[in-house]
Interface confidence: low
Amino acid sequence: QSGPLPKPSLQALPSSLVPLEKPVTLRCQGPPGVDLYRLEKLSSSRYQDQAVLFIPAMKRSLAGRYRCSYQNGSLWSLPSDQLELVATGVFAKPSLSAQPGPAVSSGGDVTLQCQTRYGFDQFALYKEGDPAPYKNPERWYRASFPIITVTAAHSGTYRCYSFSSRDPYLWSAPSDPLELVVTGT
């Protein structure tokens, strides 16, 4: 085969958001018959020549960016997309509230606000059942998450996290859940 081998996939199970002391498995998946896998933590000298890394108890310094690649014969694959492994529960949980309130009419507006006693400059909002954080353009790193023109799809349970741009993979514990109810749908 000419050119680099196609990149493998790298995933964290059950999630890339891992509470301190909880287990997580990083799994690198390439095509069948791979000779060698290499899983590495970026910006460090750490790597292992195995496809699976089981972390029995998440720690602060295991948080960070990971990637993997594989070798067949003398050829190395392209690296996987980076996986951002986040340690949660490093800091006390923020509080999450809805303005003007957690019950909102369909078509109305609501703002979810994440607040903390600490001087964090970054916030992430997650909706239960969605693997990716809720992102509103240019408001990902703000304490306020406006939801304009609410629909039934916005109903659900939300949690937020706070963290610092200086240590972007060390997050607070999740806020208590906030149930957003959309009425009149």
């Epitope: 000298s45 790597y47 108890a57 602060r60 310094s61």
Partner: antibody, heavy 121, light 107 residues
Framework: EVQLVQSGGGVVQPGGSLRLSCAAS????????MHWVRQAPGKGLEWVAF????????YYADSVKGRFTISRDNSKNTLYLQMNSLRAEDTAVYYC????????????????WGRGTMVTV | DIQMTQSPSTLSASIGDRVTITCRAS??????LAWYQQKPGKAPKLLIY???SLASGAPSRFSGSGSGTDFTLTISSLQPDDFATYYC?????????FGGGTKLEIK
């Protein structure tokens, strides 16, 4: 309370053997890598050995390789250091300390320490 | 092996002084560096991990900085309890290595 309680130190003749123990409590011992660090009288700290949480990886300082063996019994929450062919330069206070969960190499700084046990050769 | 060179080996200072201890690695260790405080007859106590993160229970007057090969431990205002020996340690690669120590004495 998180603690590491050490035992097994003493006086031994050159060429002799000794086994140090470190009993852990207050945390999930079986999830943590563990280390031994030593300090000769009036000297600085020297890392001695490491064992992975499940015992599958072990690393040693060159100065003790082939003479010392680190092991653990997770059912007893206990870490061991078997020291054979002891030399005068092995005289030191030996500390056990946690190494967190990790990959093929080390992961975090040591923040739980035993009180140390003196070995005199 | 990665050599850790600490300076000075002895430092005399007074209560209230701002004190700086430096540590140099023989090769880049990113930020995998810790600082410990040790008092005579006692086990070391973790002050700083990951070069600049304050360990749980460590007073806020201690701070760490640096990345790569050059690192610094700073005590913003020296207190009576701070007179001790300080060690840096790299945990980037095995064998793990410590600096030679800095003994902080009362002037």
């Amino acid at each position: 309370e998180v603690q590491l309680v050490q035992s097994g130190g003493g006086v031994v003749q050159p060429g002799g053997s000794l086994r140090l123990s470190c009993a852990a409590s207050g945390f999930t011992f079986s999830s943590y890598g563990m280390h031994w660090v030593r300090q000769a009288p009036g000297k600085g700290l020297e890392w001695v050995a490491f064992i992975r949480y499940d015992g599958s990886n072990k690393y040693y300082a060159d100065s003790v390789k082939g003479r010392f063996t680190i092991s653990r019994d997770n059912s007893k929450n206990t870490l061991y250091l078997q020291m054979n062919s002891l030399r005068a330069e092995d005289t030191a206070v030996y500390y056990c300390t946690d190494g967190w969960a990790e990959m093929a190499t080390t992961d975090d700084a040591f923040d739980i320490w035993g009180r140390g046990t003196m070995v005199t050769v | 092996d990665i050599q850790m060179t600490q300076s000075p080996s002895t430092l005399s200072a007074s209560i209230g002084d701002r004190v700086t201890i430096t540590c140099r690695a023989s090769e880049g260790i990113y930020h995998w560096l810790a600082w410990y405080q040790q008092k005579p007859g006692k086990a070391p106590k973790l002050l700083i991990y990951k070069a600049s993160s304050l360990a749980s229970g460590a007073p806020s007057r201690f701070s760490g900085s640096g990345s790569g090969t050059d690192f610094t431990l700073t005590i913003s205002s020296l207190q009576p309890d701070d007179f001790a020996t300080y060690y840096c340690q790299q945990y980037s690669n095995y064998p793990l290595t410590f600096g030679g120590g800095t003994k902080l004495e009362i002037k």
